[in-house]
Interface confidence: low
């Protein structure tokens, strides 16, 4: 069974998939559609790297631009380095500025809803 066939079989279960399953899926050439991606748990999407999301979506990665103001894409963008987002070439804005350090402080995020940024 190829990656696409496997994806079709498990598509209906993906809404609650944890991060590790999504990371594994990104290596299987599944080309997840945007509608499915938008239904994923935000907390499962946030830890994914730009490269992992790009592999997960395949040719559908361009759809991130249309969804950049909506969860989970909006929250995921806020967690990525702007440099990394720029490699997608989609004009996604709102990433962590170059030279900033991300402190993964759960309390800070609970209060503000965004990662804590330290300047250079």
């Amino acid at each position: 069974m190829n990656g696409s066939e496997y994806f079709v079989k498990i598509q209906s279960f993906l809404g609650g998939a944890p991060t590790e399953d999504l990371k594994a899926l990104s290596q299987q050439n599944v080309s997840m559609d945007l509608a499915t991606f938008m239904k994923l748990r935000t907390d499962a999407v946030l830890p994914l790297t730009v490269a992992e999301v790009q592999k997960l979506l395949g040719p559908h990665v361009e759809g991130l631009k249309a969804e950049e103001r909506h969860r989970p894409v909006r929250d995921w963008i806020l967690r990525q380095r702007q440099d990394d987002l720029d490699t997608l070439g989609l004009g996604l804005q709102g990433g962590i500025p170059n030279g900033y350090l991300v402190l993964d402080l759960s309390m800070q995020e609970a209060l503000s809803g965004t990662p804590c940024l330290l300047g250079p």
Epitope: Q54, G58, P59, H60, V61, E62, G63, D86, T87, L88, G89, L90
Partner: antibody
């Protein structure tokens, strides 16, 4: 902001060659294929070929394979399309259009076009 | 090569009315289709990719649908600025190919 600035209009004699340039800015040049598409007066758009600026790899439309050469100058973020053995039916507007290497080639950005006129 | 056949060649629609353009691929291209708008003397402008996704900044009156071999671009309420030629393009396989274009005018 993505910008693609093409060289100016050219008038050529049949049998001659023409080299059109496309200077790119606003994105990472080596992260995008550069495609060339032409449009003869009143005709449909016609894909000619592309080049991967990172690897130098290319694909050509068989129709042009022996006459077209697509190259890049990475240091200048510029792509070139050279068409040889020109004939009157090569009179057309030639466009450059990039697409992100990791996705399928839909063209969100286009150069302004370069008119090439072939006339004796 | 995959041949993209558009219909109709031209279309006259009243302002505020719906315009529908069809594109048929000679073989299955999945949803690997884009739609472009071209006004006289201008470069093509991307409207839709992956058959149904609008590019950023494209008004929501433009929508795309279809998969496999049959695709449709719909302008739900035609505006004066929509007068143009519309092209479909398949990017399922090389060589990339375009439809012959549909000219949309105001009735």
């Amino acid at each position: 902001e993505v910008q693609l600035v093409q060289s100016g209009a050219e008038v050529k004699k049949p049998g001659a060659s023409v080299k059109v340039s496309c200077k790119a800015s606003g994105y990472t040049f080596t992260s995008y294929w550069m495609h060339w598409v032409r449009q003869a007066p009143g005709q449909r758009l016609e894909w000619m070929g592309n080049v991967n600026p990172s690897s130098g790899g290319s694909n050509y439309n068989e129709k042009f394979k022996n006459r077209v050469t697509i190259t890049v100058d990475k240091s200048a973020s510029t792509a070139y399309m050279e068409l040889s053995s020109l004939r009157s039916e090569d009179t057309a507007v030639y466009y450059c259009a990039p697409h992100y290497i990791g996705s399928r080639p839909g063209f969100a950005y286009w150069g302004q076009g370069t008119l090439v006129t072939v006339s004796s | 090569d995959i041949v993209m056949t558009q219909s109709p060649d031209s279309l006259a629609v009243s302002l505020g009315e719906r315009a529908t353009i069809n594109c048929k691929a000679s073989q299955n291209v999945g949803t690997n289709i884009a739609w472009y708008q071209q006004k006289p003397g201008q470069s093509p402008k991307a409207l839709i990719y992956s058959a149904s996704y609008r590019y950023s900044g494209v008004p929501d009156r433009f929508s795309g649908s279809g998969s496999g071999t049959d695709f449709t671009l719909t302008i739900s309420s035609l505006q004066a600025e929509d007068v143009a030629v519309y092209y479909c393009q398949q990017y399922n396989s090389y060589p990339l190919t375009f439809g012959g274009g549909t000219k949309v005018e105001i009735k």
